[in-house]
């Protein structure tokens, strides 16, 4: 089993639409069970997206390049919640996700109608299959929710920004 | 054949130390976060830590955390866990033991033979 | 963490029965829970994961079912070689916990 998520990190406006994109490939002949699933940061990151992340933090990532602060830490210390889930046809949402615009397309791709502010973290396309127990199950990709302020280009030059037309 | 073969154990006094290695062969060492689980004298499976797959991730359970430390050798496929100050809940039967997928959220598919850890007086 | 119980420290059945083990956890695990078989003097065994998907090599009198919070571990005839440990596991969030086991005695 391969699991691809193209995009590591993406930036979306706040009550726009966004589709977080999922690639997978398996020997197995079953079909797959895709999941998506969120789960928010170990600490916040709009700080440091603002430039005003610790020291601590910053020394700590700087002497181990394998390790972020805001993405590495145990779920048990984070939130950790199923967005969607897809079986054949049928697309469940998570409980903390029903009565939102949210859906799975194309296989794999999460669609989210409306971007709310509790919508920043990271984001996992899990997928399961019968008789595929190797490889690489799940990918994540990395969504930053912004308001309109006019400095987004100086904000987060790292990301790449996409703004739906309303 | 995926194969895990630790050692290490014994028997060791409250507040001395012990080293644990964990061979491994047939995968690719290097792409698998590997997990350390103890199962205790009641048969209760508890994990006891588990490292990334390049070695720069540790996670550790409070019961366990400043006390032990687990890391790896990816030139030797090997992977260890250092305890210290051991107290007689530590005694257990130590497993290494890794997942099926080299990265994602999936069960243990492969466990070692164990090594026993006593802690007495 | 998430606490995975079992509620059934041994059950005893006969060859030739069907033996059903439940796990309960404490929060929803969706469909992420394991299976495993321990015989005596062995280490565990996989034999079911997410739920309700058989390891490769298990036996299909072996199978599982449930979401959510609550699991159900099937054997549909139990053999003699059946006598074991069975225990669950969450593999939804880390850290991964196992309940406290359920041992199959054979009468």
């Known amino acids: 089993l391969q699991v691809t998520v193209p995009d590591k990190k993406k930036v979306a406006m706040l009550f726009q639409p966004t589709v977080l994109r999922c690639h997978f490939s398996t020997s197995s002949h079953q079909p797959a069970v895709v999941q998506w699933k969120f789960k928010s940061y170990c600490q916040d990151r709009m700080g440091e997206s603002l430039g005003m992340s610790s020291t601590r933090a910053q020394s700590l990532s700087k002497r181990n390049l394998e390790w972020d602060p805001y993405l590495d830490c145990l779920d048990s210390r984070r939130t950790v919640r199923v967005v969607a889930s897809k079986q054949g046809s049928t697309v469940t949402l998570g409980d903390f996700y029903r009565g939102r615009e949210i859906t799975i397309v194309h296989d794999a791709d999460l669609q989210i109608g409306k971007l709310m502010w509790g919508d920043s973290g990271l984001y996992y396309c899990i997928i399961t299959t019968p008789d595929d127990l190797e490889g690489k199950n799940e990918d994540s990709v990395e969504l930053l929710v912004l308001g309109r302020t006019g400095l987004l280009a100086d904000l987060l030059p790292s990301f790449a920004v996409e703004i739906m037309p309303e | 054949e995926v194969k895990m073969v630790e050692s290490g154990g014994g028997l060791v006094q409250p507040g001395g130390s012990l080293k644990l290695s964990c061979a491994t062969s047939g995968f690719t060492f290097s792409d698998y976060y590997m997990y350390w689980v103890r199962q205790t004298p009641e048969k209760r499976l508890e994990w006891v830590a588990y490292?990334?797959?390049?070695?720069?991730?540790?996670y550790y359970p409070d019961t366990v955390k400043g006390r032990f430390t687990i890391s790896r050798d990816n030139a030797k496929n090997t992977l260890y866990l250092q305890m210290s100050r051991l107290k007689s809940e530590d005694t257990a039967m130590y497993y290494c033991?890794?997942?099926?997928?080299?990265?994602?959220?999936?069960?243990?598919?492969?466990w070692g033979q164990g090594t026993l850890v006593t802690v007495s007086a | 963490d998430i606490v995975m119980t079992q509620s059934h420290k041994f059950m005893s059945t006969s060859v030739g029965d069907r033996v059903s083990i439940t796990c309960k956890a404490s929060q929803d695990v969706s469909t992420a829970v394991a299976w495993y078989q321990q015989k005596p003097g062995q280490s565990p065994k996989l034999l079911i994961y997410?739920?309700?998907y058989r390891y490769t090599g298990v036996p299909d009198r072996f199978t599982g079912s449930g979401s959510g919070t609550d699991f159900t571990f099937t054997i549909s005839s139990v053999q003699a070689e059946d006598l074991a440990v069975y225990y669950c596991?969450?593999?939804?969030?880390?850290?991964?916990?196992f309940g406290g086991g359920t041992k199959l005695e054979i009468k």
């Open positions: 490292i990334s797959n390049g070695g720069g991730s540790t």
């Open positions: 997410s739920a309700s």
């Open positions: 596991q969450q593999h939804y969030s880390t850290p991964y916990t």
């Open positions: 033991a890794r997942q099926g997928y080299y990265y994602g959220s999936s069960p243990f598919a492969y």
